[in-house]
């Protein structure tokens, strides 16, 4: 799915209002310095691509985060604010339903969610804005200068 035409500000608002709190709940008891963020993204569409991948695609050691509250809210936000996203996810949803019934929090899953927090942080606060657009410049732009 191409995330270029999403309403980024609405997705950001959804993240700050609810999704971030669910990620914090999932990570509760884990120090923010415990995992080193290694996954990065260059612009907002790329960030959403990486967020989708880490949230919904099974990985070694973390079979599925898709049934977690933050994942369900992420899916809802993308469905609402990214035109045509829902249609692309029908087959993926069927595969997820077959994947796993129970939720098990492993250290690998905690690390993955820590990476997700870094991706969301980057999505929310990119530094370079394109003229007249809600999207942002790529890394390889010739410019390349960049609590709770």
């Amino acid at each position: 799915y191409d995330f270029t035409n999403c309403d980024f500000e609405k997705i950001k608002a959804a993240y700050l209002s609810t999704i971030s709190k669910d990620l914090i709940t999932y990570m509760s008891g884990t120090k923010s310095t415990e995992f080193n963020n290694t996954v990065s993204c260059s612009n907002r569409p790329h960030c959403l691509t990486e967020i989708q991948s880490l949230t919904f695609n099974p990985t070694a050691g973390c079979a599925s985060l898709a049934k977690e509250m933050f994942a369900m809210k992420t899916k809802a936000a993308l469905a609402i604010w990214c035109p045509g996203y829902s249609e692309t996810q029908i087959n993926a949803t069927q595969a997820m339903k077959k994947a796993r019934k129970s939720k098990v929090t492993t250290n690998k899953c905690l690390e993955q969610v820590s990476q997700l927090q870094g991706l969301w942080r980057r999505f929310n606060r990119p530094l370079l804005k394109q003229q007249g657009s809600s999207d942002y410049k790529d890394d390889d732009d010739k410019h390349h200068h960049h609590h709770h």
Epitope: A13, L16, R121, R122, P126, L127, K137, D139, H147
Partner: antibody, heavy 120, light 111 residues
């Protein structure tokens, strides 16, 4: 706990340049925006610019655009702010600050400040 | 640039009394229903410290006598019962539009 430690005070001549460093410890460096803010004696806070160390992307306050350069070295978790063509009105305390964990955009960790005095 | 104007420039309040600081933006700092306005406290010789984020959310470890309200262009920081340790300069900051800008500061003293 994340800490930002800045380089020591500097005294500079008008027309020269100054480079202030800000070393991060106790947490991930590359995926947080790092900002530079200055405060002239008895005055308010003024945002100068920021860098995303992950790829070196920067954003500058146009007021300083031609004179300030912000860089970062991921290998040493250090951000730098260089200000050129110094004048007396650049006398100030220069702070580095890191954005929060969640992308809210507030500055939750600050360096101790570096005093730069510009005098002939 | 968005200009942030705080009022008053200085304020003297008795211990235990309420202190109110206002911040007005030259244009709205709201986006998608959220207000991208933060408040900081700065004591002499120290860097600023976050008090409130997004207009009304208390920063980590900040006492609940501090509160914030407002949206769009008009925001208020309130200290419900002034304590001696609250003597400081207070700044509002908008992060909705580059360049990020701060108010000129409000100096709070004890009467």
């Amino acid at each position: 706990e994340v800490q930002l430690v800045q380089s020591g005070a500097e005294v500079k001549k008008p027309g020269s340049s100054v480079k202030v460093s800000c070393k991060a410890s106790g947490g991930t460096f590359s995926t947080y925006n790092m900002h530079w803010v200055r405060q002239a004696p008895g005055q308010g806070l003024e945002w100068m610019g920021a860098i995303y160390p992950g790829n070196g992307e920067t954003s500058y306050n146009q007021k300083f655009k031609d004179r300030v350069t912000i860089t970062a070295d991921k290998s040493t978790s250090t951000a730098y702010m260089e200000l050129s063509s110094l004048r007396s009105e650049d006398t100030a305390v220069y702070y580095c600050a890191r954005e929060d964990d969640y992308g809210e955009g507030y500055f939750d960790v600050w360096g101790q400040g570096t005093t730069v005095t510009v005098s002939s | 640039d968005i200009v942030m104007t705080q009022s008053p420039d200085s304020l003297a309040v008795s211990l235990g009394e309420r202190a109110t600081i206002n911040c007005r933006a030259s244009e709205s700092v709201d986006n998608s229903g959220l207000s991208f306005m933060h408040w900081y406290q700065q004591k002499p010789g120290q860097p600023p410290k976050l008090l409130l984020y997004r207009a009304s959310n208390l920063g980590s470890g900040i006492p609940d006598r501090f509160s914030g309200s407002g949206s769009g262009t008009d925001f208020t920081l309130t200290i419900s019962s002034l304590q001696a340790e609250d003597v400081a300069v207070y700044y509002c900051q908008q992060i909705n539009t580059d360049p990020l800008t701060f108010g000129q500061g409000t100096k709070l003293e004890i009467k």
